[in-house]
Amino acid sequence: NQDLPVIKCVLINHKNNDSSVGKSSSYPMVSESPEDLGCALRPQSSGTVYEAAAVEVDVSASITLQVLVDAPGNISCLWVFKHSSLNCQPHFDLQNRGVVSMVILKMTETQAGEYLLFIQSEATNYTILFTVSIRNTLLYTLRRPYFRKMENQDALVCISESVPEPIVEWVLCDSQGESCKEESPAVVKKEEKVLHELFGTDIRCCARNELGRECTRLFTIDLNQTPQTTLPQLFLKVGEPLWIRCKAVHVNHGFGLTWELENKALEEGNYFEMSTYSTNRTMIRILFAFVSSVARNDTGYYTCSSSKHPSQSALVTIVEKGFINATNSSEDYEIDQYEEFCFSVRFKAYPQIRCTWTFSRKSFPCEQKGLDNGYSISKFCNHKHQPGEYIFHAENDDAQFTKMFTLNIRRKPQVLAEASASQASCFSDGYPLPSWTWKKCSDKSPNCTEEITEGVWNRKANRKVFGQWVSSSTLNMSEAIKGFLVKCCAYNSLGTSCETILLNSPGPFPFIQDNIS
């Protein structure tokens, strides 16, 4: 049909920085580059109906559905969503095309469905149909990458069976220790699945998708390094592939490497060797031991021997299911107000854990560091000297682990007071938990030295606010003290704090804070 307009439907994904419901807009916010939804005429439909490609959106994502109309003259429009009409304000771009937009901010289930756009131009009327659904992230997975030898080549392939398809990258480092941290200049990243350069000091493969990033390190024994004090240990689950690399450098090429499992040479097909020149004409040799799918009987001591280096071993342990080994007993700490202190959990786990530190219902990122003895450690130092209960939670595919910590900050009590018609109460959060005294101020005792013992009720731990104990003391009002000033004092090994209360009639009481160190 000659009169049909040329139309283009696009999807624009936005960086989220707003929260609102779907709204029609003529000027969408700054965004990513548009994705063509290829509006096509819907066959066998009554009237002129264009259908855009289905749109899948992440929960909370923000998008704009946009139609560009190349038709002469003015246009008018109307959006319809779930039988409700939504206002539509077309405008014209620099190429004089009509532009109609629907902005959906912070996508929710209620905003999924069919969006119909009715457009009326001078020449014709037509409808555009958009179907918007929420991406089913329940099906998403991110699996730790593993290695395979590339068929008939001296190369490793990195595989991560994840949904959506992950981006795979090799993370290579050629220096020792700390300088191999992720953002160090010594680290080189290669966004490819196959790696031919297998001689580096530290080789890791990482896979990332919408769920995050998982990495696997190529387990390496370096015969030129002093062996660790404890035997390196590698855990694997039944069915997983085993890869161990043995590496050695020597002044010339006259040396060889061999792998043995429990003093028996590995079968052919379970190893391969490579060599290349290193600095000052020395020769690097690497020998890989690999099993494509491990069984329980692959457990044992794998020893790499060289004709020119002392041999070194690693203990490979094959387990039926993953584990997290750590002591889960709760731990209490008391520290001074300015003392440097970190919580720490030492654990052994396979597969690698995901973890969080939680305090006062707020979660904090959790970093873990491998120790030489096969254990890992996670530390949390960002407590800002806030007393209370801190929780370390760790999990992997097969196990969960939770450990509680209580942090007490040694400090002088701070006293808060309140009073009603029948009683006066004082509260303090100092640590160690304070003891209380009440004193009556009178003509006989202007310095408030007359102690009150009758009608006093102390509660050592009145309420627990995220593990922070609050001590309270209540004085029941009697005729003997009505109309007098009374003083409650909280004291511990670090000092004393007092509040003075006028016990007259109900209402706002004047409180006078009185700090005595």
Epitope: D154, H253, G256, F272, M274, M283
Partner: antibody, heavy 119, light 112 residues
Framework: QVQLVQSGAEVKKPGASVKVSCKAS????????MHWVRQAPGQGLEWMGI????????VYAQTFQGRVTMTRDTSTSTVYMELSSLRSEDTAVYYC????????????WGQGTMVTVSS | DIVMTQSPLSLPVTPGEPASISCRSS???????????LDWYLQKPGQSPQLLIY???NRASGVPDRFSGSGSGTDFTLKISRVEAEDVGVYYC?????????FGQGTRLEIK
């Protein structure tokens, strides 16, 4: 001492295949790469490919891709080079050579095997 | 493929005199590890080739010290300080940086 001993001369018809062997001795077979190089009569040297005896990985020159197969037998410390669909231009001396690393440095060479392709 | 060009193709030398052979590659043979992947081979009449120099300037074991290699990147030179009668044959340079490894066309050294 370290040496590479190759199989004897061969005469083949065009279209046939030839399999040349190279037996290594005097060193640990799996720790050095093995290359194959050929030399047509009166011509220069031409690299054909490489095999890693440890694992059997191979890389072939594009010129021979699809026609050459390099294999090894670790039990006898022998590598093999098979060239198929022979033509008269394949008439040459075929050498196996031990590579110190994967990138060249052919320090030990076999004595060469003369392959003649003639109808 | 990397193209290797040798010059001269023929080199008549008087015994005791020095000799020099040049080899040029179509692209740099300098690897990121600092090595130049260039080897020199000598093929004596009726024999298999033998390794003289590897990694541009390193003499192979058993090679007399009158042979030396130099150069970097794309330009390399093999020098013989005093030619002896046993040095006759064809000298080849070869790049080992990337497959397919390629040889120069050869330089025939003969005694005058």
């Amino acid at each position: 001492q370290v040496q590479l001993v190759q199989s004897g001369a061969e005469v083949k018809k065009p279209g046939a295949s030839v399999k040349v062997s190279c037996k290594a001795s005097g060193y640990t077979f799996t720790i050095y790469y093995m290359h194959w190089v050929r030399q047509a009569p009166g011509q220069g040297l031409e690299w054909m490919g490489i095999i890693n005896p440890s694992g059997g990985s191979t890389v072939y020159a594009q010129t021979f891709q699809g026609r050459v197969t390099m294999t090894r037998d670790t039990s006898t410390s022998t590598v093999y080079m098979e060239l198929s669909s022979l033509r008269s231009e394949d008439t040459a001396v075929y050498y196996c050579a031990r590579g110190i690393g994967s990138k060249g440095a052919f320090d030990i060479w076999g004595q060469g095997t003369m392959v003649t392709v003639s109808s | 493929d990397i193209v290797m060009t040798q010059s001269p193709l023929s080199l008549p030398v008087t015994p005791g005199e020095p000799a020099s052979i040049s080899c040029r590659s179509s692209q740099s043979l300098l690897h990121s590890n600092g090595y130049n992947y260039l080897d020199w081979y000598l093929q004596k009449p009726g024999q298999s080739p033998q390794l003289l120099i590897y990694l541009g300037s390193n003499r192979a074991s058993g090679v007399p010290d009158r042979f030396s290699g130099s150069g970097s990147g794309t330009d390399f030179t093999l020098k013989i300080s005093r030619v002896e009668a046993e040095d006759v044959g064809v000298y080849y340079c070869m790049q080992g940086l990337q497959t397919p490894y390629t040889f120069g066309q050869g330089t025939r050294l003969e005694i005058k």
